[in-house]
């Protein structure tokens, strides 16, 4: 069964800046990755970025840089300032759509006890 992993890290240099990394463990052709916060995209979450392997990347504030790390993993850096910036207990979710298996998603947040720079 395919799985999705999510890591959330707060940057040591910018305490309100986050890096989210997500990966897909499974076979099939990844068609789309959707990153959201505040819950899954289909359950009230707000889309931060959509990554397509052929048609490019779309991102919305406070997302600063979304990119493919490998064919099956992505990373997203969030801006740390402004009214829409994330807080330490924000939930981030990644949904990988794989053809023809379907979609697989997982969520993660910064561990309560984590220091800046520590991975979830």
């Amino acid at each position: 069964t395919p799985e999705v992993w999510v890591q959330v890290r707060m940057e040591a240099t910018e305490l309100s800046s986050f890096t989210i990394r997500c990966g897909f463990l499974g076979s099939g052709s990844i068609s789309l990755v959707t990153v959201s916060w505040g819950g899954p995209n289909g359950a009230g979450g707000t889309t931060l970025a959509v990554l397509h392997p052929e048609r490019g990347i779309r991102q919305w504030a406070p997302a600063r840089q979304a990119r493919w790390e490998t064919q099956s993993s992505i990373s997203l850096i969030l801006e740390g300032s402004g009214a829409s910036s994330p807080c330490a207990n924000t939930t981030f979710c990644c949904k990988f759509a794989s053809f023809p298996e379907g979609s697989w998603e997982a969520c993660g947040s910064l561990p309560p006890s984590s220091d800046p720079g520590l991975s979830a």
Partner: antibody
Framework: EVQLVESGGGLVKPGGSLRLSCAAS????????MSWVRQAPGKGLELVSA????????YYPDTVKGRFTISRDNAKNSLYLQMNSLRAEDTAVYYC?????????????WGQGTLVTVSS | EIVMTQSPPTLSLSPGERVTLSCKAS??????VAWYQEKPGQAPRLLIY???HRFTGIPARFSGSGSGTDFTLTISSLQPEDFAVYYC?????????FGQGTKLEIK
């Protein structure tokens, strides 16, 4: 304008074979996953085969597995369905459809359909 | 396999009426739900994707809603051309499945 045009349907005896074709135009065929969906007389819609944009991943339900083979030729903008060991219950209108990754794999374009009748 | 159950199977209504069609999934399908309209002798047509997004050219009287396992398609004021069969569809998990359809007929 997106166009999908099916051909190859007809009357065939039980146990016989048919090859359906779908000619695509008006879009970059190689960027889209494709499917064959059928509708038997008085019945609902059934997805009978799907293929990823690069042709590497395919899907078949148990009802046709081992009898039907989906393939594509991206150089010719064409989708195919080879149907062997046909049965009376395979009688249906067969539609070629295009999946849109950005729409959760919803099928946003359909052909007009080609009728396959399996009867002795 | 995720089973999509539509209700009712048939509805008899008059033009101008408001109608709500129901689709229930046997397990959560996130937001990967679409609705199609099919008329006799015509190919199915995509109406709604991602639960609530209207496809290009679809009139505003069509709307979709729901989450998790319960989804609805609403037509705010039926027009003569809306009498057809409507199918919900999930592409969340393979095997992708359709509901059995709801037929809207003129009363």
């Amino acid at each position: 304008e997106v166009q999908l045009v099916e051909s190859g349907g007809g009357l065939v005896k039980p146990g016989g074979s048919l090859r359906l074709s779908c000619a695509a135009s008006g879009f970059t065929f190689s960027s889209y996953h494709m499917s064959w969906v059928r509708q038997a007389p008085g019945k609902g819609l059934e997805l009978v085969s799907a293929i990823s944009r690069d042709g590497d991943s395919t899907y078949y339900p148990d009802t046709v597995k081992g009898r039907f083979t989906i393939s594509r030729d991206n150089a010719k903008n064409s989708l195919y369905l080879q149907m062997n060991s046909l049965r009376a219950e395979d009688t249906a209108v067969y539609y070629c459809s295009r999946h849109e990754d950005y729409f959760g794999f919803a099928m946003d374009s359909w052909g007009q359909g080609t009728l396959v009748t399996v009867s002795s | 396999e995720i089973v999509m159950t539509q209700s009712p199977p048939t509805l008899s209504l008059s033009p101008g009426e408001r109608v709500t069609l129901s689709c229930k999934a046997s397990q959560s399908v996130s937001n990967d739900v679409a609705w199609y309209q099919e008329k006799p002798g015509q190919a199915p047509r995509l109406l709604i994707y991602y639960v609530s997004h209207r496809f290009t050219g679809i009139p505003a009287r069509f709307s979709g809603s729901g989450s998790g396992t319960d989804f609805t398609l609403t037509i705010s004021s039926l027009q003569p051309e809306d009498f057809a069969v409507y199918y919900c569809h999930q592409a969340y998990r393979s095997p992708w499945t359709f509901g059995q359809g709801t037929k809207l007929e003129i009363k």
